[in-house]
C-alpha cells in the first residue's frame, strides 16, 4: 500500500460578484491540507446570472430570488452534497451598488436585504452580502493576480507556470475596468506616499508590501459613456447628437431621463428642450478620443503627480495585468497580443471606428447589437484612460498584459476576497513540510 493515494480532502468556496452590469458566481476549490500554500486555490466554475446588475432590481426586489436561482442551483450541482454545509458563500457588490447607495441608502439596503434572504435559503454557509469599497476592489484584484502568478511564493522555480511569470518575485500591478468604476493598484518604487488615502500595507507570506490603489467611481466603461453623452448633448444645437464614438450610419434614440438617472451625469445635467435625442454615428477615432479626454480633469493636481481629477498617482512601476473589461474589450478587438504596440493599437482603433455600421453588423452577426455598437467607444476609452489617465507611454505599453484567466481562474477581485475572508493568506511564510501527511500511506 506504499504508493496508494488516499482521496484528497477538498474544500470549496463561492463568491458572487454583483457588478454594475451583471452578476457572476464563482466556485473555487482547494486541497484542505494545503490551505496556506500559495497558488493552490483554483476556479472550477463561473456562472453568469442572466440579466442586469442587482441595483437594477430596486423596484422589483421580489424578483431577486428567481434571478439568482439558476446559478445557485448550479453551485448545488457542482459542489458535492457532503460539502454544502461547510462551503462559504460571499456576495460582494461593487460600483453599481455604490452608486445606488449614493442615491438612496434605504433602497441599497433593501436590495442587499433581499439578496441576503435569497442566499440564506440555500444549504451553504452563507457569510453575508455587502458593498465592498473601491479600495478593497483594487486590493483584492491585486492579490488575485499575484496569487495566481505565484508572486507570493518563496520557492524559486526553474520553469514558468504561466506566460508572464519570470522568476523574479516582483509583483504585477492590477488594472481593473468594470461598468461603473475602474481601479489601479501597484507597488510603487518609492515606499513613502503623499496620499495616505491611497496607501495600503500588507504582510503576506512573510513579506511586507506597500501598495498604492485608487478606484475611480463613474469611470467604468458604461458610466464613462453616459458621462460623455451628457457632456456632449449640452452643446448640441438640436436633438441630434453626431457622435464620433459610434460607427458611421449607426443611429440610436436615447431618453434624457435615462441619461440623467445616474449620479455620474449630475455634473453635466441641464434642462434640455427635448425628452429624447438621436445618436448618429460618424465613426472618427481622433474626435472620439478628444471627447473622452474632456472627462479627465488634468488641470488641477495638489500632489507631485496625478492621474486625473486631482487624484495622486505615483510613477508607474513594473508590469501590469489588465483584466475584466480591459481584457473583454481588447480581446474582442483582437488587440491583446504582447506583440501589438500602442501605435498599432491606435491605428487599428482608427480603422475599426471608421467602418460603417452595416459592415460591422455583417462581420459580427452573432454579437448583440447593443454591445457591438459600443466597442468603438470602449476601445477608445481604454486607450485614453491608460495613456492620458494613468500616463502609460508607447514604451511602457509593453508592460501591460491583457489577462482574462490565469491558469484557468478569472482575473478579478473575487478570489482575493475569498482568500482574505477564509484566512487563506497567512501573514507569515508557512513552514514547508517535506511531504503532505495525507498523500501516501
Amino acid at each position: 500500500t506504499q504508493n496508494k493515494a488516499l482521496p484528497e480532502n477538498i474544500k470549496y468556496g463561492i463568491v458572487l460578484d454583483a457588478g454594475s452590469s451583471h452578476t457572476s458566481l464563482y466556485i473555487y476549490k482547494w486541497p484542505a491540507e494545503k490551505e496556506n500554500d500559495t497558488g493552490v486555490v483554483h476556479q472550477v466554475e463561473e456562472c453568469r446570472v442572466k440579466g442586469p446588475g442587482i441595483s437594477k432590481y430596486v423596484q422589483k426586489v421580489n424578483e431577486i430570488g428567481i434571478y439568482l436561482t439558476d446559478c445557485m442551483e448550479r453551485a448545488r450541482e457542482v459542489i458535492p452534497r457532503s460539502q454544502h454545509q461547510e462551503t462559504p458563500v460571499y456576495l460582494g457588490a461593487t460600483a453599481g451598488m455604490r452608486l445606488l447607495r449614493m442615491e438612496s441608502e434605504e433602497l441599497a439596503d433593501r436590495v442587499l436585504d433581499v439578496v441576503e434572504r435569497s442566499l440564506s435559503n440555500y444549504p451553504f454557509d452563507f457569510q453575508g452580502a455587502r458593498i465592498i469599497t473601491g479600495q478593497e476592489e483594487g486590493a483584492y484584484g491585486w492579490i488575485t493576480i499575484n496569487y495566481l502568478l505565484g508572486k507570493f511564493s518563496q520557492k524559486t522555480r526553474w520553469f514558468s507556470i504561466v506566460p508572464y511569470e519570470t522568476n523574479n518575485q516582483e509583483t504585477f500591478g492590477a488594472l481593473d475596468l468594470g461598468g461603473a468604476s475602474t481601479q489601479i493598484t501597484f507597488v510603487p518604487q518609492n515606499q513613502t506616499t503623499e496620499s495616505p488615502d491611497n496607501a495600503l500595507q500588507f504582510r503576506l507570506y512573510g513579506k511586507d508590501y506597500n501598495v498604492y490603489t485608487h478606484s475611480f467611481l463613474c469611470y467604468g466603461k458604461d458610466q464613462a459613456l453616459w458621462q460623455k453623452l451628457a457632456k456632449d448633448i449640452q452643446v448640441a444645437s438640436n436633438e441630434i447628437l453626431r457622435d464620433p464614438c459610434f460607427h458611421p450610419g449607426y443611429k440610436k434614440v436615447v431618453n434624457v431621463s435615462d441619461l440623467y438617472k445616474t449620479p455620474c451625469t449630475k455634473r453635466f445635467e441641464m434642462t434640455l428642450p427635448f425628452q429624447q435625442f438621436e445618436i448618429q454615428g460618424i465613426g472618427n477615432y481622433q474626435q472620439c478620443h478628444q471627447s473622452v479626454l474632456e472627462l479627465f480633469n488634468t488641470s488641477y493636481c495638489p500632489y507631485s503627480q496625478c492621474a486625473f481629477n486631482g487624484i495622486f498617482l505615483p510613477p508607474l512601476q513594473g508590469d501590469f495585468g489588465a483584466f475584466s473589461a480591459f481584457y473583454f474589450v481588447m480581446n474582442f478587438l483582437n488587440l491583446t497580443s504582447e506583440k501589438v504596440s500602442q501605435e498599432k493599437v491606435t491605428e487599428m482603433m482608427k480603422k475599426f471606428c471608421s467602418q460603417p455600421w452595416e459592415e460591422i453588423k455583417t462581420s459580427y452577426a452573432g454579437v448583440k447589437e447593443k454591445y457591438l455598437s459600443e466597442y468603438c467607444f470602449s476601445g477608445t476609452y481604454i486607450l485614453s484612460l491608460l495613456l492620458q489617465g494613468y500616463h502609460f507611454t508607447a514604451d511602457s505599453w509593453e508592460h501591460i498584459h491583457f489577462i482574462g484567466k490565469i491558469q484557468g481562474s478569472d482575473a478579478g477581485w473575487t478570489l482575493g476576497y475569498m482568500l482574505n475572508l477564509t484566512n487563506m493568506i497567512p501573514a507569515e511564510q508557512p513552514l514547508s513540510t517535506p511531504l503532505s501527511h495525507s498523500t501516501y500511506v
Epitope: 442572466k50 440579466g51 442586469p52 428567481i66 436561482t69 439558476d70 448583440k368 447593443k370
Partner: nanobody
Amino acid sequence: EVQLLESGGGLVQPGRSLRLSCAASGDIFSINYMGWYRQAPGNERELVAAITGRGNTNYADSVKGRFTISRDNSKNTVYLQMNSLKPEDTAVYYCNAWDYSDYDEGPLREYDYWGQGTQVTVSS
C-alpha cells in the same frame, strides 16, 4: 408575440387545493422565466412563484411549502399547484412570461407577457 391563457381558478374552501394552468403560444423561444403573480383588491401585484428555463424554482415566503410551480416544456404550459389554501390567498392570479434585459438602460425586462388573470377565492 407570446399569448398566455390561464385556467383552473374558482371558489374553494380553506385547506383545500386548486391547480392553475397557463398555456403559452407564439414566440416562446424568447422566454426564460415563467411565473404566477397575484393581486388582491387594494393591493399591489406580487410575485407568488417563478420557474426558470432550467426548471429551477423560487417562491414568495407566504406560499413556501404550500404552493408548487412546475413547467411542461413539451406542452408549453406552466402549472401552479396550490395546497392548504387560506382566505388570504384570495386574489386574481396572473400568468407571466418574461426574460431579463442584459442592459443597464431602459426597462429591466426585455420581454414581458401577461395572461388575462383567473380569480381564486378561498372562502367557507
